[in-house]
Interface confidence: medium
């Protein structure tokens, strides 16, 4: 999947746009809004009748080096008795994102943007049906 | 930084962090071949907590869209198809990294930019506060 | 078509664990729900409890919870049902079972079974 | 947990016979699923959601009832139906089966 270039019809490409290679972009890394921060003191993810849990995953070669994963708790849902209801179903509820991924070869580093699945929670749906014949 | 573990052949001058800025193939490689969209296309109507998708366009940044979710309602939906309003629909927020193209309207420059999404929304107890 | 191929059976002594495998073909291991279920001496069927590969989502009998410990190697699709501190009531058959995707079914749907794996505990 | 009693445990009747195998819960259920274990075998969906036929049964099996009483029905017994039966609830954590059924053939 390639990054569109930015179309004509919009803009008109600035003077100022450093030169790069063929086949590659530039890219800093100095993230933007790095200090923003989601509130957690909700604790959504224990009061959600499909609750989740949070795994942290961490790769010294990815940029950034952590992401939180989330984990449906149950199969089923959380009715108000706090039992869990079989008839409704824990679903995860996920998001693509950047990283930067350092490959190495050789002695040689490359780098490479890639797109990766987070799942940010867990929702309770309904089933379509009960069952498939 | 980060810090990269190196091959002990490598020459020292090798920096161990990720450098501030890299250049990078313009094609995006997708980890997510072993999901199946369409089954959770359609969670956003079947959940106890609905919410509606709005499109937020930007032609600066990649991805130029990004859906953002809604919920709703303030309550959650009950067995019967109602509105309870004993529990209340709430946004699952996620922090994810774009790009941001700088300079600005450079083809082949960018950015890594943190932004707040809501993807979804689940159906929690409330924290019930009573003001005397 | 949908396969289930459980491990061998196993003869443990007291207070030793036990792990049964299922290996499953046939299908996207992610995309369904797996299940465990007991059978003592051909006698009433026991839920023990499921797991969903893909959200880590496990919901367990609390007869089993301390007991039964339900895991997935998804790389492998393959499920897993480890059982600890065994006693001599933990003698039985255990199946595997394919539940729902949670998606077109409940994710409690059962509808295919592995051959069972039969632990005999004694001393 | 909902309690699931079956009766009779255990039944003897001839090839061509109508049997009954009826399934009582504790409490209130939606939803009743029936399974046949051979001999051997492992268990075989055979009636879901009450009354529904599961894929390549026999239309001689069929189910009804609803809230806390349920039945399996056979109208006409073959000598493949020898097995034990099992019913099981699907409306309330945990899943829970009936002790079972055992048909033979007299």
């Known amino acids: 999947r390639k990054i569109p270039k930015v179309g004509h019809t919009f803009f008109q490409k600035p003077e100022s746009c450093p030169p790069v290679p063929g086949g590659s972009m530039k890219l800093d890394i100095g993230i933007i809004n790095e200090n923003q921060r989601v509130s957690m003191s909700r604790n959504i993810e224990s009061r959600s009748t499909s609750p989740w849990n949070y795994t942290v995953t961490w790769d010294p070669n990815r940029y950034p080096s952590e992401v939180v994963q989330a984990q449906c708790r149950n199969l089923g849902c959380i009715n108000a008795q706090g039992k869990e209801d079989i008839s409704m179903n824990s679903v995860p509820i996920q998001q693509e994102t950047l990283v930067v991924r350092r490959k190495h070869q050789g002695c040689s580093v490359s780098f490479q943007l890639e797109k990766v699945l987070v799942t940010v929670g867990c929702t309770c749906v309904t089933p379509v049906i009960h069952h498939v014949q | 930084g980060i810090t990269i573990p190196r091959n002990p052949g490598c020459p020292n001058s090798e920096d161990k962090n990720f450098p501030r800025t890299v250049m990078v193939n313009l094609n995006i490689h997708n980890r997510n071949t072993n999901t199946n969209p369409k089954r959770s296309s359609d969670y956003y109507n079947r959940s106890t907590s609905p919410w509606n998708l709005h499109r937020n366009e930007d032609p600066e940044r990649y991805p130029s869209v990004i859906w953002e979710a809604k919920c709703r309602h303030l309550g959650c939906i009950n067995a019967d198809g109602n509105v309870d309003y004993h529990m209340n629909s709430v946004p699952i927020q996620q922090e994810i990294l774009v790009l941001r193209r700088e300079p600005p309207h450079c083809p082949n420059s960018f950015r890594l930019e943190k932004i707040l999404v809501s993807v979804g929304c689940t159906c929690v107890t409330p924290i019930v506060h009573h003001v005397a | 078509q949908v396969q289930l191929v459980q491990s061998g059976a196993e003869v443990k002594k007291p207070g030793a664990s036990v792990k049964v495998s299922c290996k499953a073909s046939g299908y996207t291991f992610n995309e369904y729900t797996m299940h465990w279920v007991k059978q003592s001496h051909g006698q009433r069927l026991e839920w023990m409890g499921g797991i969903n590969p893909n959200s880590g989502g496990v919901s367990y009998n609390q007869n089993f919870k301390g007991k039964a410990t339900l895991t997935v190697d998804t790389s492998a699709s393959t499920a897993y049902m480890e059982l600890s501190s065994l006693r001599s009531e933990d003698t039985a058959v255990y199946y595997c079972?394919?539940?729902?995707?949670?998606?077109?079914?409940?994710?409690?749907?059962?509808?295919?079974w592995g051959q069972g794996t039969t632990v005999t505990v004694s001393s | 947990d909902i309690q699931m009693t079956q009766s009779p445990s255990s039944l003897s009747a001839s090839v061509g016979d109508r049997v009954t195998i009826t399934c009582s819960a504790s409490?209130?259920?939606?939803?009743m699923h029936w399974y046949q274990q051979k001999p051997g075998k492992v268990p075989k969906l055979l009636i879901y959601?009450?009354?529904k036929l599961a894929s390549g049964v026999p239309s001689r099996f069929s189910g009804s009832g609803s809230g806390t009483d349920f039945t399996l029905t056979i109208s006409s017994l073959q000598p493949e139906d020898v097995a034990t039966y099992y019913c099981?609830?699907?409306?309330?954590?945990?899943?829970?089966f009936g002790q079972g059924t055992k048909l033979e053939i007299k």
């Open positions: 409490s209130s259920v939606n939803y």
């Open positions: 099981q609830q699907w409306n309330s954590h945990p899943l829970t």
């Open positions: 959601d009450t009354s």
């Open positions: 079972a394919r539940g729902g995707d949670g998606y077109y079914t409940n994710y409690f749907d059962i509808d295919y």
